[in-house]
Amino acid sequence: PGPPAGSPRVSSDPRADLDSAVLLTRSLLADTRQLAAQMRDKFPADGDHNLDSLPTLAMSAGTLGSLQLPGVLTRLRVDLMSYFRHVQWLRRAAGPSLKTLEPELGALQARLERLLRRLQLLMSRLALPQAAPDQPAVPLGPPASAWGSIRAAHAILGGLHLTLDWAVRGLLLLKTRL
């Protein structure tokens, strides 16, 4: 019967997926930076704010050189899923003071979801082991006060900003290894 007909190319390949992930991460970083600045303008922060349920920062500048593709992608997806849940929680639990930022928080959540899907696709295409994206979440109770939700927003946006910052660097470095 002769050689079989080939398949047409699908819309992307792993390297294009990685490029797309870098672009999405950069765009999300810019959004987060802008939203954090808006927060500081509207609700000046009195020092650094922490939230115990947020993931600890995965990487430092010193460890970038030793990054491995599976570890970075797995950790990034797990951390971003946690931030996704925290943004969801913030939108639900936010008092009237944060309602003015609802459109921006909604857009941030949608972009986070898009990036998570792109990372999952990349891991599938590379056949890397994937931690379940919806691992049981730390239950997040309602903030104690309006000021509590503002502090939480500062912490979430600050942590997400740092995470996305190392993610851009890490993904760019991984591009050279794929």
């Epitope: 390949d13 390297r15 295409r125 590379l126 056949a127 794929l178």
Partner: antibody, heavy 114, light 111 residues
Amino acid sequence: EVQLLESGGGLVQPGGSLRLSCAASGFTFSSYGMHWVRQAPGKGLEWVAVISYDGSYKYYADSVKGRFTISRDNSKNTLYLQMNSLRAEDTAVYYCAAGVPDYWGQGTLVTVSS
Amino acid sequence: QSVLTQPPSASGTPGQRVTISCSGSSSNIWSGYDVHWYQQLPGTAPKLLIYSNEERPSGVPDRFSGSKSGTSASLAISGLRSEDEADYYCAAWDSSLYGPVFGGGTKLTVL
């Protein structure tokens, strides 16, 4: 155009061995995880094994664990499946597939019968 | 027994819209893994139809669409044509297998 061309199928007796090969072209083979998926006559698709883009991760369906070995040679753009201790229930068309899987070969028939 | 559950058959007349469902378990769809759909025409190899729940590869007509909600996913085919008669399979990554799992397949008949 992407092409995946399987070879090595045929008739083998129970307990015997076969080695399937899959030659890839038209895409960056070394950037894709690769799978073997099989389909018994008149049945649905069953995933068999997967190997990561660089060969560092390999996973198998329970039904073939310990009997089948997946491997790849990125310098030759070729995927392999070494099948030992074959059983009648391994009779199927074996497809080589790339990525999600995004791309599939046309398949090679493996018949295990005495 | 397939890990993902699909109806064994579906049918419709030309021009109609049909949907095929796919439900999973805690180690695949319920865990948030994306769903992919394949079309297998009689006597041929499977072909990727939808990936990442709703994305269409280039060359796939926009009559085909996918969606996912919570614990299940579905494939919709609008403006049904005779050439759509085929077997359709859903698939998702499974964390207990470290590989993809497939549905049992749905045979679509165009009446």
